[in-house]
Structure formats: structure tokens, C-alpha cells
């Protein structure tokens, strides 16, 4: 028949009893049985007694009574009763268990780790139990990650089980740390602490600290140092393999450095005394941590005696460029042991010559290369203890990018102006290594007569290469080149002679060599205005006349031309704009802005200024003109006409100079008839002079001049007598 499982006197899966009380638990079964108790309950303890007896009907059953006197909190756990000698496959029917809480208000946790935390090993991705089980099922426990984080049970990832503690179903690195279970009982806070610790198999780095390859003379000692770096919670095994391993030629020492707060450093040092040729070959350091593995190799070369070989790396003549931050002059050297290295420049120790020379291995580094670094460089190699010496020389050419000297010394903020029609000489002096070639280019200015934009000369225009026969732009007289020693350097001077300056544009001289190209732009602006800025007053007007001023500026040098009137108000000079550039007339070389003030009055007197802005400097330039409007004044003659006699066929002049404001108009009359200009009769400037060519007797008579303006008129007359009359006259 089927065996019925043992029965416990306390029913259910769990039971709570108070600390200090006696726990009674009886097991009744159909076969001999034994008790399984919490580890903290010692079967030898005087507190514990287990009494066996026959029981049941006819005494056919087996009974066992467990008595635990003065039960303690740490006795909390599973108490189970199971049959002896029953196959494990039927365990369920052969065992009965109950979880008994021994409740102690002074000890909520079964295991207390308050002073020294308990270490729990964890594996990421696996279940992690924080075993802060309690002595009473109704104690509320909080799980904290020291000091600020609380892990809240969610019934899935974090589960609270009063018999086990906190179960974290899928532990991550975030659970690594000091985890504290906290419970408050009767106003007292109790804590039990756990340190979760993750053992890793990470190998961060493996290195052999000696240079690669390792070179030794026969009979010397070989020392190889292998270093493995790992996280703090990793341990490693380090092994070596090497050529004469079978004869155990090497001795190996190991040590660990844990002084770094973030990593462990493991060292394995291999030593072979008095190396032989058989010790040459590959040495491998192998590092293993669980499944992780890393290795590192080095080659060991054994030499019989010291030697040096030295060759040019490329060619014997080397080239570099002035201005280079650093140039490495190096030779191909094979030597052992390492020789002493000295570099000579033109026969003298280089590093003593200049602080810019540094020796690095078999190389000479020249910092901030200059032209003076050109020369012969010799490497001297010596192994003095073995009396081995070698040297080799290389020539260094330092190429220099062309420089144009006029470019460096030019201090003009804005371009020069070249008078229209003038002959001009333009020069560029260039230096470079190799010697640069100089060519001249011409770029005409863009003439833009739209109102929106000023005429300008920009780099956008097409550039033309010039030669003496070029018919582009201005007529060229010649392009010549000569060598000149300036500041001790052989420089090339190129001169362009412009025969007839007519077209504005940009001349460029371009100096080129294999290092590079440099250009100088010469703005060649033609001016038909003296100094590129001229103000003109047609005449000083009188009241009622028109004031006519004109301002002419070079159109490539100036913009924003405006006429302004300067007025002084309370000791301050005020500028009143009276015309703008939009009224200006643009011509080939200049802009003219005319100002006309009609019918002026005395109040129009003042300082008139033409203002323009220099395109290059942005500076505003003023040219002033004082204008004084004169009062109207009736004409008056400076000298009256006087009678005079003139020989026939000769010429004569009559002057009628009058002043007045406005300037009087002069009218001539002869015998009261108005004289018009005709062949033989010429009216001079402003009609103030009457000139009669080849006088005839008809020219005799009363001559009358009249000066008239708005204020009145004045007249004067005189008789002109013609002498040496014709026969007719003589007869009379």
C-alpha cells in the first residue's frame, strides 16, 4: 500500500513563536524518521531534546517529539521530519516541513551583520539573494544600496520573502555595492549589511615592458618584465614560453601591485643569466583568467660582438622648406649595443650650435627650420668600449618660399593714384630658394555705372599675363629683370614700365619657385583729378546769381560723395548735407558731383565742403570752399574811354573795364549803332575789350561803351580819329 507522509503537530507552512519560549513539535509517521533542523540549532545543544516513542493504534506508528527550550531568534528556519531509508524520488510523501519564526523584538534579523558586512558573490544576469530573513513574518524590511538608493520590491525583479530575504531575479552591476536591509521595531532601527562582490575574468592589458626586439650580447643577462592589468576583482595566471624552455633556462618571479585604486597590476619577470645563441627567438607571456586569455610576444636577438652599419635613408642630398615646424634628418642605423650619437653641422657639433637642434635616437631634429640650416650634416656613431666608430654625411638644402620685399615694407594704407597719361615704373624685388621667376599680370577694373554699386576693382575680374608686347590694358614700354644683392642676399628685381597710364586696374607681380608662389597687387588707379580730389567754384556769385560748385573725386579711391554746408551754432560746427551721390556724374576715371544753388542770397554765404569716404581706409575726407555772396552794386567804370588817334591800316584796342555786382554786361556802340563781332572787329573777354584790326577811315567816329547790371548802368564815350586818310580825304 501507498506510504503516507509524516505529520507534524503544528499545521500549515509556517508558525510564529516568541523568543525565550519553549518550542514543542511532534512528528508522527508510519516509518522511522529523523529531524532536519536549522544550522543554528545544534543537535548536541542542551536546549534541544528529541524523544522517540511508539504511538498510534496498536503502537504501530512512530512518533518523535522535538523540544527546544528558550528558543532564540537565530533558531528561525525550516524544521522538517522525514522517513529514513526511503528512495529520494518519493521525497514529497516522505517529508513534512514547517518554517518556524522565533520572534524577537530586539532582533528582527535572523543573521545580523552590523559591524562587518557579509560578502555575497554575485553573477550578472543570475538570481541574487540578499539573505536578510526575519524572525517574524510581519516585519517590514527596506533594502537600501548605501547610502542613498532604495530598492523597492515590485514582485517581479525585486521580491521580498520573509524566509529568504530579498530576491533579485536578474542581478546587474547596479546591485554591486553595500546593500543594507533595514527594519524598524518599537522605534529602533536595525540594519544588516551585505557587500555584493562580482568576480570577473577581465584582462585589461598585457605588456612586455622591455623594448622590442630585445638585443643582447652573448654572455649578458636577459630580463623580460610582463605586466597584466585587471579590474580589482580579477585574478590571473601568468606563464612564459621561450626557446630553451625544455632545459628550464629561465627563472620567473611574480608579484602583484594593489596600490592602484582602480586596477590590479600583476608582474611576471623572466630572467636568463649569461645568454647563449640558443636563447635567441620568440618569448611569449601568456595571461589567463578563467576563460579569458591574452598574450604578448617579443623577439630576442643575441649578438657575438658589437657592430655599427649606417646608410642614407633616401638620398645623400636632402631638401626641406624654411618655416617648417620641425625637420627630422635621419640615417638608417643598425648597431649593437646602442652607440653614442653626435651630429655635426659643417664640421661643428650641431646641438652646441643652436638650441633648435635636438638629437633623438639616430635622428637630428631641426626645430623651426630657417635658411641658415642648410649645410652638411655628419652623424658620428661610436661604441667606445668596443672601439667601433662610423660616420656618414648628408647635405641639406633649405628651400625658401618666395618673398616680395615691397610687400613687406609697403606702409600705404590705400593705393597710389597715377596721373592720366603719365609714364610709370613699377618694381617688385623677390627672394627665394631656388631663385624665383617673376611674372606680371594685369586685371582691369570693373566699370559699373549702375546706381546700386560703386565702381570697384576686385579679384573677380579675369587676369592677363603680360609681356613687353602685350596690348592689354596700358601700353607697356618694357619688362626687365636684374639681380641685386640686398641685405647680403641675391635678389631678383623685376621692373614694369607703363608708357602711357590710361586704364585703371591691378598690376600683380607673381614670384614662384618649387616651394610656392607669392604675389603683390599694385592698385593702378588713373586719376584725371589732382590728388584724386578736387573742388571747383565757377565764380564767386553775387546776390540773385546761381552758385555753381563742382567736386571731382577718383572713382576707385572714393565713394559716398556729398556736398555739405558747415554752420557754427553755439560754438559747435554742424554739418548739413545738401546733396547726395545719386546726383553724381560718373566718368571713366572720376565722379563729379555738381552743386548749383539758384538765385543766391547773402545768407547762402558760408563754408561749403565736399565730403567723400576713402574706400580703403573708411576715412571721411573733406575739401572746403569758402563762399562769400556779394551785395548787388551798380556798375562803375575803372577808366573812362578817352579820345585817341590811330594810323590807317594799323590796329587799335579800346578798353571798357567795369566793376559791379553782378558782373556788368558790356555793350559797344559806334555813332550810336550797336557793334556786333564781325571780321576785323573782335570783342575781347566779357566784351570789355574792343579790338579793331587794320583800321580803315570808316572806323573813325564816336565809340561808346555801356556797362549794365540789375542795379543800373554806366557809360563812357570817346572819338577815334583815323590818320592818313585816302586821296579823297586829302583832296578835301
Amino acid at each position: 500500500s501507498k506510504l503516507k507522509g509524516p505529520e507534524l503537530s503544528l499545521k500549515g507552512t509556517q508558525h510564529v513563536t516568541q523568543a525565550g519560549q519553549t518550542l514543542h513539535l511532534q512528528c508522527r509517521g508510519e516509518a522511522a524518521h529523523q529531524w532536519s533542523l536549522p544550522e543554528t540549532v545544534s543537535k548536541e545543544s542542551k536546549r534541544l531534546s528529541i524523544t522517540k516513542s511508539a504511538c498510534g493504534r496498536n503502537g504501530k506508528q512512530f512518533c518523535s517529539t522535538l523540544t527546544l527550550n528558550a528558543a532564540q531568534a537565530n533558531h528561525t528556519g525550516f524544521y522538517s521530519c522525514k522517513y529514513l531509508a526511503v528512495p529520494t524520488s518519493k521525497k514529497k510523501e516522505t517529508e513534512s516541513a514547517i518554517y518556524i519564526f522565533i520572534s524577537d523584538t530586539g532582533r528582527p534579523f535572523v543573521e545580523m551583520y552590523s559591524e562587518i558586512p557579509e560578502i555575497i558573490h554575485m553573477t550578472e544576469g543570475r538570481e541574487l539573494i540578499i539573505p536578510c530573513r526575519v524572525t517574524s513574518p510581519n516585519i517590514t524590511v527596506t533594502l537600501k544600496k548605501f547610502p542613498l538608493d532604495t530598492l523597492i520590491p515590485d514582485g517581479k525583479r525585486v521580491i521580498w520573502d520573509s524566509r529568504k530575504g530579498f530576491i533579485i531575479s536578474n542581478a546587474t552591476y547596479k546591485e554591486i555595492g553595500l546593500l543594507t536591509c533595514e527594519a524598524t521595531v518599537n522605534g529602533h532601527l536595525y540594519k544588516t549589511n551585505y557587500l555584493t562582490h562580482r568576480q570577473t575574468n577581465t584582462i585589461i592589458d598585457v605588456q612586455i615592458s622591455t623594448p622590442r626586439p630585445v638585443k643582447l650580447l652573448r654572455g649578458h643577462t636577459l630580463i623580460l618584465n610582463c605586466t597584466a592589468t585587471t579590474p580589482l576583482n580579477t585574478r590571473v595566471q601568468m606563464t612564459w614560453s621561450y626557446p630553451d624552455e625544455k632545459n628550464k633556462r629561465a627563472s620567473v618571479r611574480r608579484r602583484i601591485d594593489q596600490s592602484n585604486s582602480h586596477a590590479n597590476i600583476f608582474y611576471s619577470v623572466l630572467t636568463i643569466d649569461k645568454v647563449q645563441n640558443k636563447d635567441k627567438g620568440l618569448y611569449t607571456c601568456r595571461v589567463r583568467s578563467g576563460p579569458s586569455f591574452k598574450s604578448v610576444n617579443t623577439s630576442v636577438h643575441i649578438y657575438d660582438k658589437a657592430f655599427i652599419t649606417v646608410k642614407h635613408r633616401k638620398q645623400q642630398v636632402l631638401e626641406t622648406v624654411a618655416g617648417k615646424r620641425s625637420y627630422r634628418l635621419s640615417m638608417k642605423v643598425k648597431a649593437f649595443p646602442s652607440p653614442e650619437v653626435v651630429w655635426l653641422k659643417d664640421g661643428l657639433p650641431a646641438t652646441e650650435k643652436s638650441a633648435r637642434y635636438l638629437t633623438r635616437g639616430y635622428s637630428l631634429i631641426i626645430k623651426d627650420v630657417t635658411e641658415e640650416d642648410a649645410g652638411n650634416y655628419t652623424i658620428l656613431l661610436s661604441i667606445k668600449q668596443s672601439n667601433v666608430f662610423k660616420n656618414l654625411t648628408a647635405t641639406l638644402i633649405v628651400n625658401v618660399k618666395p618673398q616680395i620685399y615691397e610687400k613687406a615694407v609697403s606702409s600705404f594704407p590705400d593705393p597710389a593714384l597715377y596721373p592720366l597719361g603719365s609714364r610709370q615704373i613699377l618694381t617688385c624685388t623677390a627672394y627665394g630658394i631656388p631663385r624665383p621667376t617673376i611674372k606680371w599680370c594685369w586685371r582691369p577694373c570693373n566699370h559699373n555705372h549702375s546706381e546700386a554699386r560703386y565702381d570697384f576693382c576686385s579679384n573677380n575680374e579675369e587676369s592677363f599675363i603680360l609681356d613687353p608686347d602685350s596690348n592689354i590694358g596700358n601700353r607697356i614700354e618694357s619688362i626687365t629683370q636684374r639681380m641685386a644683392i640686398i641685405e647680403g642676399k641675391n635678389k631678383t628685381a623685376s621692373t614694369l614700365v607703363v608708357a602711357d597710364s590710361r586704364i585703371s586696374g591691378i598690376y600683380s607681380c607673381i614670384a614662384s619657385n618649387k616651394v610656392g608662389t607669392v604675389g603683390r597687387n599694385i592698385s593702378f588707379y588713373i586719376t584725371d583729378v589732382p590728388n584724386g580730389f578736387h573742388v571747383n567754384l565757377e565764380k564767386m556769385p553775387t546776390e540773385g546769381e546761381d552758385l555753381k560748385l563742382s567736386c571731382t573725386v577718383n572713382k576707385f579711391l572714393y565713394r559716398d560723395v556729398t556736398w555739405i554746408l558747415l554752420r557754427t551754432v553755439n560754438n559747435r560746427t554742424m554739418h548739413y548735407s545738401i546733396s547726395k551721390q545719386k546726383m553724381a556724374i560718373t566718368k571713366e576715371h572720376s565722379i563729379t558731383l555738381n552743386l548749383t544753388i539758384m538765385n543766391v542770397s547773402l545768407e547762402d554765404s558760408g563754408t561749403y565742403a565736399c565730403r567723400a569716404r576713402n574706400v580703403y581706409t573708411g576715412e571721411e575726407i573733406l575739401q572746403k570752399k569758402e563762399v562769400t555772396i556779394r551785395d548787388q552794386e551798380a556798375p562803375y567804370l575803372l577808366r573812362n574811354l578817352s579820345d585817341h588817334t590811330v594810323a590807317i591800316s594799323s590796329s587799335t584796342t579800346l578798353d571798357c573795364h567795369a566793376n559791379g555786382a553782378p558782373e556788368p554786361q558790356i555793350t559797344w556802340f559806334k555813332n550810336n549803332h550797336k557793334i556786333q563781332q564781325e571780321p576785323g572787329i573782335i570783342l575781347g573777354p566779357g566784351s570789355s575789350t574792343l579790338f579793331i584790326e587794320r583800321v580803315t577811315e570808316e572806323d573813325e567816329g564816336v565809340y561808346h561803351c555801356k556797362a549794365t547790371n540789375q542795379k543800373g548802368s554806366v557809360e563812357s564815350s570817346a572819338y577815334l580819329t583815323v590818320q592818313g586818310t585816302s586821296d579823297k580825304s586829302n583832296l578835301e
Epitope: 552590523s114 559591524e115 558586512p117 548605501f146 547610502p147 542613498l148 538608493d149 532604495t150 552591476y173 547596479k174 554591486i176 555595492g177 553595500l178 532601527l189 540594519k191 549589511n193 557587500l195 585604486s261
Partner: antibody, heavy 119, light 111 residues
Framework: EVQLLESGGGSVQPGGSLRLSCTAS????????MNWVRQAPGKGLDWVSS?????????YHVDSVKGRFTISRDNSKNTLYLQMNSLRAEDTAIYYC???????????WGQGTTVTVSS | QSVLTQPPSASGTPGQRVTISCSGS????????VNWYQQIPGTAPKLLIY???QRPSGVPDRFSGSKSGTSASLAISGLQSDDEADYYC???????????FGGGTKLTVLG
Amino acid sequence: EVQLLESGGGSVQPGGSLRLSCTASGFNFEDYGMNWVRQAPGKGLDWVSSINRQGDISTYHVDSVKGRFTISRDNSKNTLYLQMNSLRAEDTAIYYCTKNHDYHGMDVWGQGTTVTVSS
Amino acid sequence: QSVLTQPPSASGTPGQRVTISCSGSRSNIGNNFVNWYQQIPGTAPKLLIYLNSQRPSGVPDRFSGSKSGTSASLAISGLQSDDEADYYCASWDDSLNGWVFGGGTKLTVLG
């Protein structure tokens, strides 16, 4: 290399405000609780505020700054903040930003930023 | 007034052993771990001891910590001139819900 760099200190009048920042580098910022600790001139260390790693559950402040100072963090910028309002003369100190270790206390400290409150 | 109590000063000659005490209450030292910090003048504090007695990597074994009940102590043996600094004890305080520090002990190395 693990580093904390504070900024935002300066001089302010009583009643004024300042915002201190602490930029972290060399470690996974979001995995660690952070703190502000201050040291008045010639005096000892005083804890000011703490914030847990998530920055949305637990923040703690010393009583003397409660209601005036707020600790916060932006894990995306690896930055810890301390917003200080209604500043008083007794708040004058060097303010250190510190990181909590998994097992240790405050294992990394910044170089500090000076806050001066005076009229 | 600091929550944890430390002597304001301590001194010793090179090679000597010096002990600095730190006393608190159940809510801090009694129920939590103690940390010790060293602060060399003009620099930020540095963690010296954690979990009552553990040394971070790089801290010499001349420094040791212990805790008993609501008190803790830091011992420095084989005193050296570069140990001259301010030493602070610290602990979490459950009542204040924050860190508490001792007032600091200025250690002078004589001679």
C-alpha cells in the same frame, strides 16, 4: 581618470542666488549617488545635500538649507547642480562636489568652488 | 557644533603611533559604518578608511580604523612628516538622513 569639476561659485549679496555645477568624467555618472559638502573658512567639513543615482527618488538636505537649496542632476550631461536661493552670510564656504562609492563613503572629491555671501 | 566629536588636535614625533578618536550616537556610528578623511591644507579631502576599517587601494597600511559601539578611532603608526594634515571622521546619520562629520583633528608631526 575619475574627475569632478565644480563651477558657478562667486560673490553674492545676502538674499541672492547662485547655481553651482559639477561636471563628472571618468566614470559612469548615472550609477552613483552624489553629494555637496562645504567648508567654511578655517572650519571643518559640513554635509549640505545628497542625491541618489536616479535623481528622481531621494534627495537629502541638511536642516539649515532646507527650503533654500535644491540638489539636482542631469545624467545625460554628467552634471550635478546645487541651486542656492536666499543666501546668508553663514553660507560662505568652499563647496565640494563628491561621489559615493559602491562600498566606500565619498571616494572622489572635486577641487571645490568658493561662494562668498556679504553685503 | 559637529554631530561627531573629535579632539581638535593631536601630535606625535616621526615613527610614533597616534590615535584619533571619534564619538557619536546610535543613529550614526552605532548603526552605520565610519569613514575617515585626510585633508592636507589647501587641497580637497581624501578617503582614508571606509567600512570602519577598510583601506582604499593606495593608502599605506600604517593607517588603520576600528569601531566599537558608538565610537570609532583612527590609528597612524610609524608617523611621517607628510601625515601632517586635518583628519575627519564621517558617518551616515539615520535620524538626520544625511552625512555627519566630526569637527576635525589637526595632526602635527613634531621635530
